[in-house]
């Protein structure tokens, strides 16, 4: 029977170099498949595959292109019908737009498109145009899309191609000509300043051709070896110096790339010829002494002898010799305001020149001018004067009392200075001040002012008060009328933060200071500022108070046997209380409380009348326990009302105070009676009250007054007092 | 005897994940507080979390805020705490501690080591 | 940094007293705790509270506090007292901080 042929042979995917083949297996048993496929030449190639297989993967062909394939079940010598399809691959992507971005001497860039990601790589062949010399060949990275070719000729036809590999394929090559430039070539050279040993060359040349320049610098005529310079392609002039004098040169120039040397470039010029000695100046003049120079070529001269003579004066001169190396001296120990000629020789070998000379007239003697006290505090002056500048080494200055004979306080300040703070004086004295300069050694006459230092302004009594979380208030005392503003800063002892600074108006005594944190010790700084004067500082310390965590133990309720403790805590900021309640003897063992952390408050019960209690109340949050708040209390029976005070007395009446006791009563009785005798008459008001009405009384008689508080059943002791009607 | 018993310590990679456990016993578990405490090599101690003996409330150190969650089973007797987006600086030897409601950190586990690097 | 200060280090003769200190505001509200660790170990709280002492530490520990700062003394110091200390407390959040610690020598 014939064998089936396979079935749904399909092409499930497609790439530039390769086909991928699916089937079904036939019904009836086979051996194997046979697969054949069409080449572009028109070969066919086969290829045998095991009964098993269901796919296939055609590889190594050629892009867009059209295959046939053929697949065919076989078993023994027998064959199916073969299953047929036809599949072309892809296209690849193709090279475009190869261009020639940028032109050089000696090099090019070249720019392409292709698609993103389709490339192994990129062969670009470089070729003389015209030649058959072997081109060369670049591999570029497949990401590139734009390269620069280097290392070619100057003004040269060149023809460039390149072509792309795609998973071993070659796309079509794309070819572009181009020619390099003309060589740049150095412009004009120019010798820009000629000396007697040197000279300065100037040159043109294009930006950045060259790496260096060559210069090569030649006396004409004669066959000494040149002398050779290079200096970097950035420059565009040189100095040349170590030349002779009076003498040709032949200069060359020559730009330098790593490839070839430009076309040399040469001027040619004479030096100078040798100058004699001269300008003999003066450069400084000072009250007693001057500064020479002078011009002469290097090695001319063994050494130079200069004279100082004063002018008009037929007393021997002053003569220095130096060495011929010098072109500068300092000449000292002049007279002040003194004109002098100076003249100077040149000597070779004991042989002397012809004198330079020149006259000059030293300064006349510094003086020092308008010496000022410009400030006047109340233990000090402040002087200023003024002077010439760097002409004194040192000011002395003396200060005395007006009308005191006592030894002199004495200054030694630098020169430099035009002024200086005198301190330590005595408030509201008058004093005397002179200061004298010294130059060298000598002394410039004394100037001297007088001035009397101002009253001494005085601030103390620096106070704390009002300590809260965040602030606290200070007072202080002044002097008034003086001060023109207070500086006040707050440090915090451990300085963590930042120091706060205060400016308020001399006119003010105290100052609210807010905005502190919490729990801090602070210390406050104060000083007052009048004009020109800042007083000594004062200072006090102070501590803002702890945020209330746990705070406000109260004891209300006081009875004989017990009390209620109330206190304040932070919302949700305690795990639970403990109250510990101690007699103030330590005769009893303590009673420990331990409360929720909601609980403000405890009835104490059961406790001794008449005795002392020292009650402490602590937090705990996660096991750890606050500071405890204390408070101490007395139990006691029912406290009496106290100070019975009579007032308002009329014939018939009268007014009866008196002042509550600490605990909490219902009600007061008063109890009055003649003296005399008769029957008591009782009065009951609210226990609010602290005085009531006594009426219906007899004009001209005693009457003995008790008071007692009530409270359920108790009764407190009595208070009594006495009072005679109208 | 109150005994504390640490497990779960290891090696993990930055931004990796760790979960601690505190074996109790010799204590009613649910009426304490416990916490977490981890002690960097040669360094000294710092608070990582707390949590209520009911559970109910939890607290963290700045440090691994919204990283690491503390967490107790009172029928297990165990403490927990779930450490995820670990960093180097996290490295440490993690102990639990019981707090009795007067006495802070009274007893002490022996701690696991807890080492975060890549 | 810490909310707890506590000097690196401090040394003591041995049979001497020393004192180990711990500063920091959370100390005007609430009383200090003491860790003692020895290298290798766990901590172990030697004092809590006002001057509580839990119990198997020697009478020798005792803490006291003034202001924002608390002291944890130890007179007639012992070989075996040679640790590092840490001071702990509660903070306004009621998170614990723990000081830096104080490593103590017994010469």
């Known amino acids: 029977s014939e064998l089936d042929t396979p079935k749904d042979l399909q092409v499930s995917e497609t790439a530039e170099t390769s086909l991928t083949l699916l089937w079904k297996t036939p019904l009836a048993k086979f051996d194997r498949y046979r697969l054949n496929y069409s080449l572009p030449t028109g070969q066919w190639v086969g290829v045998q595959l095991p009964r098993n297989t269901t796919s296939y993967v055609l590889r190594g062909l050629e892009p867009g292109q059209e295959y046939n394939v053929l697949l065919t079940a076989e078993k023994g010598r027998h064959k199916s019908k073969p299953a047929r399809v036809k599949a072309s691959t892809e296209q690849a992507p193709e090279l475009e737009n190869l261009t020639v971005t940028e032109v050089g001497w000696d090099g090019l860039r070249l720019n392409w498109t292709a698609a993103d990601q389709a490339y192994e790589h990129f062969i670009i062949q470089v070729q003389e145009a015209n030649k058959v010399e072997a081109a060369r060949n670049l591999t570029v990275p497949g990401s590139l899309r734009a390269v620069d070719i280097p290392g070619l000729k100057a003004a040269t036809p060149y023809t460039v191609s390149i072509y792309g590999v795609i998973q071993g394929y070659r796309t079509p090559v794309l070819s572009a000509e181009a020619s390099t430039g003309e060589t740049p070539n150095l412009g004009e050279v120019v010798v820009a300043e000629v000396g007697w040993d040197a000279l300065k060359l100037n040159w043109t040349a294009p930006e950045g051709a060259y790496e260096y320049f060559f210069i090569q610098v030649q006396e004409a005529d004669t066959v000494e070896a040149a002398q050779n310079l290079t200096v970097p392609g950035g420059l565009r002039s040189t100095d040349l110096p170590g030349l002779k004098a009076a003498t040709h040169y032949t200069i060359t120039i020559r730009g330098v790339t790593q490839d070839f040397s430009t076309t040399p470039l040469s001027v040619e010029v004479l030096t100078e010829e040798v100058p004699d000695m001269g300008n003999l100046t003066v450069t400084e003049v000072s009250w007693d002494a001057l500064r020479l120079n002078w011009t002469t070529p290097d090695g001319t001269y063994d050494q130079f002898t200069i004279q100082v003579q004063e002018a008009d004066q037929v007393e021997e001169a002053h003569n220095l010799t130096v060495p011929g190396s010098l072109r500068s001296m300092e000449i000292p120990g002049l007279r002040a305001g003194t004109p002098y000629t100076v003249t100077l020789h040149g000597e070779v070998r004991g042989h002397s020149t012809r004198p330079l000379a020149v006259e000059v007239v030293t300064e006349d003697l510094p003086q020092l001018g308008d010496l000022a006290v410009s400030e006047v505090g109340w233990d000090g002056l402040r002087l200023n004067w003024t002077a010439a500048d760097n002409a004194y080494e040192h000011f002395v200055i003396q200060v005395q009392e007006v009308n005191k004979v006592e030894a002199a306080q004495n200054l030694t300040l630098p020169g430099s200075l035009r002024a200086v703070d005198i301190p330590g004086l005595e408030a509201a004295t008058p004093y005397r001040v002179s200061i004298y300069g010294v130059i060298r050694g000598y002394r410039t006459p004394v100037l001297s002012a007088e001035a009397s230092t101002a009253k001494e302004p005085e601030i103390g009594n620096l106070n704390v008060s009002d300590i809260t979380p965040e602030s606290f208030n200070l007072s202080w005392m002044a002097t008034d009328g003086i001060f023109e503003t207070f500086t006040i800063e707050i440090i915090d002892s451990n300085r963590l933060l930042e120091t706060v600074e205060y400016n308020i108006s001399g006119a003010e005594r105290t100052a609210h200071i807010s905005g502190l944190p919490p729990s801090t010790d602070f210390i406050v700084y104060l000083s007052g500022l009048a004009p020109s004067i800042r007083t000594k500082t004062i200072s006090a310390t102070a501590t803002t108070e702890a945020l209330p965590l746990l705070e406000n133990l109260t004891i209300s309720d006081i009875n004989p046997y017990g009390f209620t403790v109330s206190w304040m805590a932070s919302e949700n900021a305690f795990d639970s209380f403990l109250v510990t309640v101690v007699d103030s003897g330590k005769l009893l063992d303590p009673q420990e409380f331990t409360l929720s952390g909601t609980q403000r408050k405890l009835e104490l019960r059961g406790l001794i009348t008449g005795i002392g209690y020292e009650v402490m109340v602590s937090g705990f949050t996660q096991g750890h326990q606050t500071k405890p708040l204390r408070a101490e209390i007395v139990t006691e029976a029912m406290g009496s009302p106290k100070e019975v005070i009579f007032s308002d007395i009329t014939e018939n009446s009268a007014t009866v105070s008196w002042r509550a006791p600490t605990a909490q009563v219902e009600s007061f009785r008063i109890t009055y009676v003649p003296i005399t005798g008769g029957t008591p008459s009782m009065v009951t008001v609210d226990g609010t009250k602290t005085q009531t009405r006594l009426v219906k009384l007899i004009p001209g008689v005693e009457y003995l007054v008790s008071i007692i508080a009530m409270k359920g059943f108790e009764e407190s002791e009595p208070v009594s007092g006495s009072f005679t009607t109208a | 005897e109150v005994q504390l018993l640490e497990s779960g310590g290891g090696l993990v990679q930055p931004g990796g994940s760790l979960r601690l456990s505190c074996a109790a016993s010799g204590f009613t578990f649910s009426s304490y507080a416990m916490s977490w405490v981890r002690q960097a090599p040669g360094k000294g101690l710092e608070w990582v979390s707390a949590?209520?003996?009911?559970?109910?409330?939890?607290y963290y150190a700045d440090s691994v805020k919204g990283r690491f969650t503390i967490s107790k089973d009172n029928s297990k007797n165990t403490l927990y705490l779930q450490m995820n987006s670990l960093r180097a600086e996290d490295t440490a030897v993690y102990y639990c501690?019981?707090?009795?409601?007067?006495?802070?950190?009274?007893?002490w586990g022996q701690g696991t080591l807890v080492t975060v690097s890549s | 940094s810490s909310e707890l200060t506590q000097d690196p280090a401090v040394s003591v003769a041995l049979g001497q007293t020393v004192r180990v200190t711990c500063q920091g505001d959370?100390?005007?509200?609430?009383?200090a705790s003491w860790y003692q660790q020895k290298p290798g170990q766990a901590p172990v709280l030697v004092i809590y509270?006002?001057?509580n002492r839990p119990s198997g530490i020697p009478d020798r520990f005792s803490g006291s506090s003034s202001g924002n700062t608390a002291s944890l003394t130890i007179t007639g110091a012992q070989a075996e007292d040679e640790a590092d200390y840490y001071c702990?407390?509660?903070?306004?959040?009621?998170?614990?901080?723990f000081g830096g610690g104080t490593k103590l020598t017994v010469l």
């Open positions: 949590i209520s003996g009911s559970g109910g409330s939890t």
């Open positions: 702990n407390s509660i903070n306004s959040t009621r998170n614990e901080v």
């Open positions: 959370s100390l005007r509200s609430y009383y």
């Open positions: 501690a019981k707090t009795s409601p007067r006495v802070p950190l009274d007893y």
């Open positions: 509270g006002k001057n």
